[in-house]
């Protein structure tokens, strides 16, 4: 088995990626500069720590979470890093152009990097549905389209619905999930005979996927609180997210055992269900008034996640061609919707309490925001899927799906790696 890219891709990928990188460097040269004010060095360090948490989540957390395939673990981790690095650069520019450009220059701050990392995280969530079926050249396209779509979605929601950074970024869960699922739907689905074993999980990669889940679990409170504008909101977000993910871990492990006829615990269920609470509280993490509510939400989210992991893969595998272990897409789509519904419930309770028609209008606005996020995710995902199907990208043949040897140089080329 040859470990080389096909010649055309070997020519196409470096040229495409390096040309793009050169273009990004030029854009940074002409249009960006650093924030000049650095009075408070202690504040700078604290601000950097939040960004660092997000980077750890993205690079290690999501990188390793998607690495459970028997023969595709190297590619999962490294391709994630590649997409993160590219996505952050493009997101910084895009956010700057969309929000600050009238002043002529994009001012880069640590907040810009924080925001860009969160935008790039969207791609890392989406790509779980297609990893193993695409090459790096295709992933570059996916990064560019998704970051652009998310940036524009956030800008539209911000301007039309008058929402702040946190509220419009928390659509990331449903956006990323539906984007990834719609891209997967466009890609060739059937796995030819003899390749079924490649999309199975193996012990060592599954352990690294669990490591990824642990990193995500530890840093999810940072993600949910990163864009809140006051200390009290951040404190509440951190606490509520922590309680929710703590309960979802207990629920995931016990629920997984409950779902198995012999009471065994499924690695795949646990990998994603431990994060369920964090996704479900995302939108309203700063609003939940007491720990027990966050814990109940974590419990419900954990049960939904385990239930989804048990019953949805069959459907997703048939319809979307998503392997059983890539459950992040439908997991996040369900849990993201749950989170949005919780927020809408809080709005409805406000309406009942206030007897104010204008708050009823808020409910409609929130439903409008959610609908817009889903529609843009599906449309841009389908567009991306169609683009990825173009012959120019020299996509891996179905027989080479989920195979590190297509992309990586292994000196020993060990059989059954």
């Amino acid at each position: 088995m040859s470990s080389k890219y096909p010649r055309s891709v070997r020519r196409c990928l470096p040229l495409w990626a390096l040309t793009l990188e050169a273009a990004l460097i030029l854009l940074f040269y002409f249009f960006t500069h650093y924030d000049a004010s650095l009075e408070d060095q202690k504040g700078l360090v604290a601000s950097y720590q939040v960004g660092q948490d997000l980077t750890v989540m993205a690079a290690i957390g999501l990188g390793f979470l998607t690495s459970s395939f028997r023969r595709h673990s190297w590619s999962s981790v490294a391709f994630n890093l590649f997409m993160l690095a590219l996505g952050v650069q493009w997101a910084i520019l895009l956010d700057g152009f969309l929000s600050q450009f009238p002043s002529g220059k994009v001012v880069i701050t640590l907040f810009s990097i924080r925001l860009a990392t969160m935008s790039a995280l969207s791609v890392l969530i989406s790509v779980d549905a297609v990893l193993g079926k695409v090459n790096l050249a295709q992933l570059v396209v996916m990064v560019l389209v998704e970051v652009t779509a998310l940036g524009n979605l956030r800008m539209v929601i911000s301007n039309i619905f008058n929402t702040d950074y946190h509220m419009n970024m928390m659509h990331i869960y449903v956006f990323a999930a539906y984007f990834g699922l719609s891209v997967a739907w466009c890609l060739p689905k059937p796995l030819p005979e003899g390749t079924e074993d490649k999309d199975q999980t193996a012990t060592i990669p599954s352990l690294s996927a669990m490591l990824g889940a642990l990193f995500l679990w530890m840093f999810w409170p940072s993600f949910n609180s990163a864009l809140l504008r006051s200390p009290i909101e951040r404190k509440n977000a951190v606490f509520n997210t922590y309680y929710a993910v703590a309960v979802s871990v207990v629920t995931a492990i016990s629920g997984s055992s409950l779902a198995h006829p012999q009471g065994k615990i499924s690695k795949t269920y646990v990998h994603s269900a431990v994060l369920a609470g964090g996704v479900a509280v995302g939108t309203s993490c700063h609003l939940i008034p007491s720990p027990w509510l966050a814990m109940v939400l974590g419990l419900v989210a954990g049960l939904i996640s385990v239930g989804g992991a048990k019953y949805l893969p069959g459907c997703c595998n048939r319809v979307l061609g998503i392997p059983h272990s890539s459950i992040m897409g439908y997991n996040f789509s369900l849990l993201g919707l749950l989170g949005e519904i919780i927020y809408i419930v809080l709005l409805v309770l406000d309406t009942v309490g206030a007897g104010n028609g204008m708050i009823g209008f808020q409910v409609l606005l929130s439903i409008g925001e959610l609908s817009l996020a889903i529609v843009i995710a599906l449309m841009s995902g389908l567009l991306t899927g169609l683009l990825l199907n173009l012959k120019i990208w020299k996509a891996p043949h179905e027989a080479k799906y989920f195979d590190d040897q297509v992309f990586w140089k292994f000196p020993h080329l060990a059989v059954g790696f």
């Epitope: 701050t109 640590l110 924080r114 911000s158 008058n162 702040d164 504008r229």
Partner: antibody, heavy 126, light 108 residues
């Protein structure tokens, strides 16, 4: 009593720079987002800039973007406004104000400016 | 965003008056966190109302805020001579803020 005290105003020529300071007393600056607001002679209030409590994010009114920079030193309990390339239309009394957030509904925090300084006058004239 | 307020209003002592604030971007909702300020000549502005209808501890009971017909509104009931001042609304626009042009309230 909680107070904000602005300083650094004065007369300056067009194109020059000036740095305003706003010192907080009887409260910890770190716990609050902070605003700069100005009022030209005989005119209404105009919001100028806002900085998050930890200094990580900043917003500016379109007419001052690229010329003004808001910053803070929480260890000194002080807020700053660096004004470059000053124009005649920047002549105004500059106020700093603190932003509070309060949860008065299940689904929303409300943001508002509760404490204002007495203002410092900036005159841009040749 | 352009915020429109009545440039001036006149009211008799003991009367009731409503000041409004409209946004060029459409209906004002609680998402805009409407704030109202009072400013007397030579003084710094003083906060009166936040979140459309919430009063500060120092705000007199005769002041009340609301949302009326897609506008933020400030109602003064039982107006006192000392209420003669300039009144400004402030709205939140996705992170940034904008003031209205102000309403000069005269108590005659």
């Amino acid at each position: 009593e909680v107070q904000l005290l602005e300083s650094g105003g004065g007369v300056v020529q067009p194109g020059r720079s000036l740095r305003l300071s706003c010192e907080a007393s009887k409260f910890t600056l770190y716990n609050y987002g902070m605003h700069w607001v100005r009022q030209a002679p005989g005119k209404g209030l105009e919001w100028v800039a806002f900085i998050w409590f930890d200094g990580s994010n900043k917003y500016y009114e379109d007419s001052v973007k690229g010329r003004f920079t808001v910053s803070r030193d929480n260890s000194k309990n002080t807020l700053y406004l660096q004004m470059n390339s000053l124009r005649a239309e920047d002549t105004a009394v500059y106020y700093c104000a603190r932003e509070l957030s309060k949860k008065v509904a299940l689904s929303r925090y409300y943001y508002y400016m509760d404490v204002w300084g007495q203002g410092t006058t900036v005159t841009v004239s040749s | 965003a352009e915020l429109t307020q009545e440039p001036s209003l006149t009211v008799s002592p003991g009367g009731t008056v409503t000041l409004t604030c409209a946004s060029s971007t459409g209906a004002v909702t609680s998402r805009y966190f409407p704030n109202w300020f009072q400013q007397k000549p030579g003084q710094a502005p003083r906060a009166l109302i936040y979140g459309s209808n919430n009063k500060h501890s120092w705000t007199p009971a005769r002041f009340s805020g609301s949302l009326l017909g897609g506008k933020a509104a400030l109602t003064l009931s039982g107006v006192q001579p000392e209420d003669e001042a300039e009144y400004y609304c402030l709205l939140f626009y996705a992170g940034a803020w904008a003031f209205g042009g102000g309403t000069k309230l005269t108590v005659l």
